[in-house]
Interface confidence: low
């Protein structure tokens, strides 16, 4: 959560001289309350936009727009504080619109916009517009808030942004998974154009159950340049347990741009028929950070083996 780096922050418009300032998120009207305060914004609109930074990176930004109510309180409106709260971290960023001239009623409703909050994929934010000065204690609130969920890197518009591309969003492994027999699973996928290793994470489940009955991790060493974009296949040995028949295969790449936090891709093979269900096994969290959409992996008390090939 940050401000777009190089844009001149402009809030002036015809009939209003205005400047945008960084804010500590604590306007002094909290400390020195005023008797007369403006009403709250009428509507807040938020949508996602993509902007370029001074370094040429494409980043997702929030486009925030709000309008004023058509009451006399605009005569006491001295500005606005925009606050964006990232819900999973409680990180907050604020800016202040400071009106350098008095607002007057004119023929159309006053409208303000701001498009400089840089956000992260797959994160939820609470956007608040607070009219200034803020109300006296126990006064009527003069702010409006709205939540906005930024799409993840699967979203077409997000896929081409720098944070998504650096997480590996442009790689499409086109995974195919085939059950060879009761004990072997063949996984095929397309390698990316980087000499990096991959990890295949196999988690098997009983039919209609979310507790795993087997898991196995297999490393694929970094391909040579001539193998880039080629198909690689791996044969995984399954646990020989009746009913342990639904297999989720997840491929985790380790691209240099995202290291152990790259986007994972998965495919699932369903059970052929309703089996018996074994005892559930507890969840765990691995040492790396799971990306959105990745599953937890499970403990296992059996052996698994695998081998792989690169196809030219």
């Amino acid at each position: 959560l940050r401000l777009l780096d190089h844009r001149a922050l402009v809030c002036s418009q015809p009939g209003l001289n205005c400047t945008v300032k960084n804010s500590t998120c604590l306007d002094d009207s909290w400390i020195h309350p005023r008797n007369l305060t403006p009403s709250s914004p009428k509507n807040i609109y938020i949508n996602l936009s993509v902007s370029s930074t001074q370094h040429g990176e494409l980043v997702p930004v929030l486009h925030v727009e709000w309008t004023l109510q058509t009451d006399a309180s605009i005569l006491y409106l001295e500005g606005a504080e925009l606050s964006v709260l990232q819900l999973n971290t409680n990180e907050r960023l604020c800016v202040r619109f400071e009106f350098l001239s008095k607002l007057r009623h004119h023929h159309r409703r006053w409208r303000f916009t701001f498009s400089h909050f840089v956000v992260d994929p797959d994160q939820e934010y609470e956007v608040t517009v607070h009219h200034l000065p803020k109300p006296i204690p126990d006064g009527d609130p003069n702010h409006q808030s709205k939540n906005f969920l930024v799409p993840d890197c699967e979203h077409a518009r997000m896929k081409v942004t720098t944070p998504c591309m650096s997480s590996g969003s442009l790689w499409d492994p086109n995974i195919t998974v085939e059950t060879l027999d009761t004990q072997h699973l063949r996984v095929d996928f397309t390698l990316w154009n980087e000499s990096t290793h991959y990890q295949i994470l196999l988690t098997s489940f009983p039919h209609m159950e979310n507790h795993s009955c087997f898991e196995h991790m297999h490393h694929i060493p970094a391909p040579r340049p001539e193998e880039f974009h080629q198909r690689s296949n791996v044969t995984l040995t399954l646990r020989n347990l009746k009913g342990c028949c639904r297999h989720q295969v997840q491929i985790q790449p380790f691209f240099s741009s995202c290291l152990n936090d790259c986007l994972r891709h998965s495919a699932t093979v369903s059970c052929p028929e309703m089996p018996d269900t074994p005892e559930p096994i507890p969840d765990y969290m691995p040492l790396w950070e799971p990306r959105s959409g990745s599953s937890d992996y499970k403990d296992d008390d059996d052996k698994g083996s695998s081998h792989h090939h690169h196809h030219h």
């Epitope: 290793h197 991790m217 152990n260 936090d261 691995p286 790396w288 950070e289 799971p290 403990d299 008390d301």
Partner: antibody
């Protein structure tokens, strides 16, 4: 060069507090989960705490739960361990350690010594 | 919580000997196991991860095997510089427990 440097250790009385820091350099700190591991004098390694890359997952060993707090500041490439209500048995060398892709911890700091004594 | 045990707790062997250290988990952990070497006064160094994968830069005389609950670290030909304490560690789920260690020295 990939490097982790711990600081903040020292002598503290039982019941006191200390804050350890770990400065990371030479790699993209914000992409990695991190751990604190300690080693009491003449003893083995004891895992203390874990924090995921975006601080969304945090774990503690039972021996420190409720007394220690792990945190990180990705903007400053720093990992922290706030240690409160310190006990004699917390005396140890404290290491920060980075997990390797695929498993284990491949980068360790030199360690900082915490001595709890009256 | 899963307990990790190591045996032996210490051993003495001659230069060139084959040395085997075992690590046992009280419950299955698949191949989520690492081995570390710690020389006196130094920080630990990763030798093996994923039970059997040799960490880059580690001499090939070190090898790891096992899956589930029983794991082995083997030094095929003990060298003077291998004098150290060796630890196993599980990393399938928190707590990421270490074994108590095996101290290796030269006869």
């Amino acid at each position: 060069e990939v490097q982790l440097v711990e600081s903040g250790g020292g002598l503290v009385q039982p019941g006191g507090s200390l804050r350890l820091s770990c400065a990371a350099s030479g790699f993209t700190f914000s992409s990695y989960s991190m751990n604190w591991v300690r080693q009491a004098p003449g003893k083995g390694l004891e895992w203390v705490s874990f924090i995921s890359a975006r601080s969304s997952t945090i774990y503690y060993a039972d021996s420190v739960k409720g007394r220690f707090t792990i945190s990180r500041d990705n903007a400053k490439n720093s990992l922290y361990l706030q240690m409160n209500s310190l006990r004699d048995e917390d005396t140890a060398v404290y290491y920060c350690a980075r997990p390797k892709v695929g498993g284990g911890m491949d980068v360790w700091g030199q360690g900082t010594t915490v001595t709890v004594s009256s | 919580d899963i307990q990790m045990t190591q045996s032996p707790s210490s051993l003495s062997a001659s230069v060139g000997d084959r040395v085997t250290i075992t690590c046992r988990a009280s419950q299955g952990i698949s191949n989520y196991l690492a081995w570390y070497q710690q020389k006196p006064g130094k920080f630990p160094e990763l030798l093996i991860y994923a039970a059997s994968t040799l960490q880059s830069g580690v001499p090939s005389r070190f090898s790891g095997s096992g899956s589930g609950t029983d794991f082995t670290l083997t030094i095929s030909s003990l060298q003077p510089e291998d004098v150290a304490t060796y630890y196993c560690q599980k990393y399938n789920r928190a707590p990421f427990t270490f074994g108590p260690g095996t101290k290796v020295d030269i006869k």
